[in-house]
Amino acid sequence: MMTGTIETTGNISAEKGGSIILQCHLSSTTAQVTQVNWEQQDQLLAICNAALGWHISPSFKDRVAPGPGLGLTLQSLTVNDTGEYFCIYHTYPDGTYTGRIFLEVLESSVAEHGARFQIP
């Protein structure tokens, strides 16, 4: 039975040209995290395997930095980066947990972080 919960940074906004940390956290389970995949709609951004380290998709390699932790730092933001991002936690023995983050990249300096929220 899957008892875990993914906590994410929720709905967030950031300024064009700036950086943002995409972060998820898996709690309420003793399952071992073997890998975390980061995806934007149907595009793979990065993979972090607990043993094998990071894979960064070449289309993002100049703008994505691994970490902190299992998170991902997205740099040099453009308005085209607006959209949904997913952290997909592969765990043993539970299986797969998915968290969602919505990022809005703003032209002006009115960007502010949204509240953290949980996805069961």
Epitope: T34, Q35, N37, E39, D42, Q43, L44, I47, N49, A50, A51, L52, G53, W54, H55, I56, S57, P58, S59, K61, P66, H90
Partner: antibody, heavy 119, light 107 residues
């Protein structure tokens, strides 16, 4: 120039073990993971597992877990794969392979080591 | 485990022809797919990574495309030296898995 030099062919008896080496040169050994791939009948490729030489962390294909052990010797920049309790199904060519920088695709391969299990 | 299926074990083609080799994943693997060429008696050689990126030094007649479950490897104009087995591989999730290989034969 990156090179992965594997040990020579092995003829072993059923039930025995084999340990294959992969000596690397031309890059910083601890900065890249090392993987092992089995090729049976000259065609089908199977990923056995990978090891992070920096911290010894391993990821195995469950099919081989318990029978395969991946290790490294950082002082000689050499990776090893030991396979135990061999049967005729283990007769194959075994490759070590190194992925790229922040990329899991395997861009450098050893020349392969032929293992024949026969009584 | 994710199964990678290369439906054609053999493909016969002529020099100068365009050839498409397909690979289907049993579940979505985004763009985490590589293609390797293996000539007789040699080790596999990386041609395409992340579904569509040509590896350093690979001739531009080799291209890759696809995302999700369906992937295609294309040789735009086959040369005699392209006689080989072509393997697809997913690295979306361990265990990394390969297709069964497609042997390209030159008529």
């Amino acid at each position: 120039e990156v090179q992965l030099q594997q040990s020579g062919p092995e003829l072993v008896k059923p039930g025995a073990s084999v340990k294959i080496s992969c000596k690397t040169s031309g890059y910083t050994f601890t900065e890249y993971t090392m993987h092992w791939v089995k090729q049976s009948h000259g065609k089908n490729l199977e990923w056995i597992g990978g090891i992070n030489p920096n911290n010894g962390g391993t990821s195995y294909n469950q099919k081989f877990k318990g029978r395969a052990t991946l290790t490294v010797d950082k002082s000689s920049s050499t990776a090893y794969m030991e396979l135990r309790s061999l049967t005729s199904d283990d007769s194959a060519v075994y490759y070590c392979a190194r992925p790229g920088w922040y990329n899991y695709a395997m861009d450098y391969w050893g020349q392969g080591t032929s293992v024949t299990v026969s009584s | 485990d994710i199964v990678m299926t290369q439906s054609h074990k053999f493909m016969s083609t002529s020099v100068g022809d365009r050839v498409n080799i397909t690979c289907k994943a049993s579940q979505g693997v985004s763009t985490a797919v590589a293609w390797y060429q293996q000539k007789p008696g040699q080790s596999p050689k990386l041609l395409i990574y992340s579904a569509s990126y040509r590896y350093t030094g690979v001739p531009d007649r080799f291209t890759g495309s696809g995302s999700g479950t369906d992937f295609t490897f294309t040789i735009s104009s086959v040369q005699a030296e392209d006689l080989a087995v072509y393997h697809c591989q997913q690295h979306y999730i361990t265990p990394w898995t390969f297709g069964g290989g497609t042997k390209l034969e030159i008529k």
